[in-house]
């Protein structure tokens, strides 16, 4: 009776020990078993999830412009006054809901290529008013003419067109036209076959970003999403040194297994350059724990603040000698056009760039820019892109619009919050799919350690005392 | 296609005063605005004056300034050169000349204006 | 005002030569820099403009090279036609101005 009472405790305590050894080894194995499995359902191949929601984003993409309509016209023009804005919005379209086209896998590098259609649908619900909304911004044409044009004799020339036109510094022009483009009066004019159509994102629909390439991650899940190149080129032509590098990914995933002290890297079409981002904090999103990446005011900090951006400098005069921060010149990147790119309401820029403005008021939370990505996957679930369009307006004494300025003027024309959260369904299923059975794993891991450990010690205790109580 | 036609030029006193005209078709005068180039004999080309696109703005050279007039009529599709006070050294083919970025893509013929008494 | 200045005045050379003829502007004209062939009796005509840029229906042998103050034209093989003079010109300010002309002749 004894004996079978003893090895009764001890089998217990051998069956405790073998659950506890059992969740030890799964802890390692299922870990190998996620990874594996992460590992081929990221990469970028017919079949896998990652590639399903790689050609056609399964998360609704919005796109909000406030649009900086400008209070004092005729005092600026006259009087090179500062510059008082109202900001107006949010505008909101609906965007990136095309799938991929051209999609193109080879084999022999292990990369996929293709081109990404873009077009933009008005949602009037979500806006604050209509596409024929008016507002007064600057004359986009008149301001780039005298910068590409430099030359005195054309300057002399497009003075006799602008005033023809009846155009002047600043025009009135609808959402629409803005955004899309419109018929230019003094461009019309130029008895040449020019491009006459100017709008901020002219043309947009019906065009294509690319093409892009990029790893498939088939035989390094390291380089999964990485552009290997873009427009068939590992360069921009855009900026000298190692700024003109296509780095990272196009930021709508990036390599499974995110650490926190990971520098994500991305490529930007919209800002023609490769910009970073660092971990800021962990959130939860719709249940799924992820990281919230940040762009570091450091990356649109000037050469002095940080030697890296030197050759994001590439002008000297408006720049004052590349001391001026948070604005970047795409010019080169907009044929020669005097566009900036900076955060909305100048957030992050130096006070000469924003002092001739009134009527800005830059917020961290409201102005910067994150990606929210669920650490094991590389997926980015939720993420807020915000960027202001500016252009440069400097005096011309050949042209009468503009001989008054006494001074060069970074204008903004518009703010934009390009956002994308996962949906609930999609949340959901991530759940299922990915965290959850990962979270179900370690609740199984715990488990069996667990119940392993305390039947082992509880059953070996009970022998132990049955043991000593027969002994006496 | 496009063709411009100098007419008018002459013999002139010192002094006189002559209106070469300069007829173009093919294109809108106004829309490029016309150049007069003269070129005295066995010497090189010099720039004479301008009537910038849609009459906007009048330039000339030091040598002819306040002596002579660029007009343009656009009705009739032709730009003018008034000359007054004329100088033997005003001596020279004179050619109308297209224009928009400043180089010179159509010429006329050219027209002699020989002053001399 | 921008003075344009052209050498060789003149250069006698045989057909199938590679000629080049140079302009040195006064001051930075960017790339705005005209060229023209004019035969005897006859209108100038347009051969480039923008320093590089060949003028439609302007043989490929003709070639500009050259931005800010040197600027070249070069015929990479000389033909019977192209014996004439050559001018430069400016067009980044008015007053617009002229080189003194190149005559290539043959030798």
């Known amino acids: 009776m004894g004996c079978d009472r003893n090895c009764g405790l001890i089998a217990g305590a051998v069956i405790g020990a073998v659950l506890a050894v059992f969740g030890g080894i799964l802890m390692p194995v299922g870990d190998m078993l996620i990874e594996k499995t992460i590992k081929r359902e990221v990469v970028l191949e017919e079949g896998t999830t990652a590639f399903k929601n790689w050609v056609k984003t399964g998360t609704t993409v919005y796109r909000q412009f406030w649009i900086f309509d400008v209070q004092n016209p005729d005092d600026v023009a006259k009087n090179s006054s500062k510059i008082k804005v109202k900001q107006r919005g949010p505008y909101t379209y609906r965007v990136r809901y095309l799938a991929k086209e051209n999609i193109t896998q080879d084999p022999e590098d292990h990369t996929v290529s293709f081109v990404q259609p873009n077009g933009a649908i008005f949602e009037p619900s979500l806006s604050v008013g209509t596409e024929d909304d008016n507002f007064t911004v600057l004359n986009l044409a008149v301001a780039a003419a005298p910068h590409i044009y430099q030359n005195s004799f054309v300057q002399v020339v497009l003075n006799s067109l602008i005033k023809k036109s009846k155009s002047s510094m600043f025009q009135t022009r609808s959402l629409k036209e803005l955004l899309w483009g419109y018929k230019d009066p003094f461009l019309s004019l130029v008895p040449y076959p020019i491009s006459t159509t100017v709008g901020v994102f002219y043309p947009y629909n019906d065009t294509v970003d690319g093409v892009y390439k990029v790893f498939n991650g088939k035989d390094n899940i390291s380089k999964v999403a990485i552009i290997e190149s873009y427009k068939g080129k590992r360069n921009l032509s855009y900026w000298p040194s190692y700024c003109d590098m296509i780095n990272g990914t196009d930021a709508a995933s990036f390599p499974p297994f995110v650490e926190k002290s990971r520098t994500l890297r991305f490529f930007s079409s919209d800002i023609c350059r490769s910009i970073y981002a660092v971990f800021g904090s962990e959130i939860d999103l719709k249940g799924i724990p992820v990281y919230r990446f940040v762009l570091p005011a450091n990356a649109f900090a000037s050469p002095l603040q940080n030697p890296d951006n030197h050759c994001f400098c590439t002008e000297k005069v408006i720049s004052n000698n590349c001391t001026s921060y948070g604005v970047l010149d795409i010019g080169k990147c907009k044929e020669g056009k005097p566009v900036y790119i900076s955060l909305p309401h100048f957030l992050h820029a130096s006070p000469d760039v924003s002092e001739p403005i009134e009527g800005l008021h830059p917020n961290e939370d409201e102005h910067r820019t994150y990606l929210d990505v669920e650490p094991i996957t590389g997926f980015t679930l939720q993420f807020a892109k915000r960027l202001q369009v500016n252009i440069l307006v400097k005096p011309a004494r050949k042209i009468e619009a503009l001989k008054n300025l006494k001074r060069p003027y970074i204008v903004p024309i518009l703010w934009l919050n390009e956002t994308g959260t996962i949906g609930d369904e999609k949340a959901e299923m991530f759940k299922t799919q990915v965290t959850g059975k990962i979270k179900l794993l370690g609740m199984v891991e715990m488990a069996l350690l667990g119940i392993g450990v305390v039947m082992f010690v509880a059953f070996m205790i009970s022998y132990c005392a049955c043991k000593s109580k027969n002994g006496k | 296609e496009v063709q411009l036609v100098e007419s008018g030029g002459g013999l002139v006193q010192p002094g006189g005063s002559l209106r070469l005209s300069c007829a173009a078709s093919?294109?809108?005068?106004?829309?490029?605005?016309i150049h007069w180039v003269r070129q005295a004999p066995g010497k090189g080309l010099e720039w004479v004056a301008w009537i910038a696109p849609y009459g906007g703005e009048e330039y000339y050279a030091d040598s002819v300034k306040g002596r002579f007039t660029i007009s343009a009529d656009t009705s009739k599709n032709t730009a003018y050169l008034q000359m007054n006070s004329l100088r033997a050294e005003d001596t020279a083919v004179y050619y109308c000349a297209r224009s928009f970025f400043g180089y010179f893509d159509y010429w006329g013929q050219g027209t002699l204006v020989t002053v001399s008494s | 005002d921008i003075q344009m200045t052209q050498s060789p005045s003149s250069l006698s050379a045989s057909v199938g030569d590679r000629v080049t003829i140079t302009c040195r502007a006064s001051?930075?004209?960017?790339?705005?820099v005209a060229w023209y062939q004019q035969k005897p009796g006859k209108a100038p005509k347009l051969l480039i403009s923008y320093a590089t840029s060949l003028y439609s229906g302007v043989p490929s042998r003709f070639s500009g090279s050259g931005s800010g103050t040197d600027f070249t034209l070069t015929i990479s093989s000389l033909q019977p036609e192209d014996f004439a003079t050559y001018y430069c010109q400016q067009h980044s300010n008015a007053p617009l101005t002229f080189g003194q002309g190149t005559k290539v002749e043959i030798k």
């Open positions: 093919g294109f809108t005068i106004s829309s490029f605005g």
């Open positions: 001051q930075d004209v960017s790339n705005w």
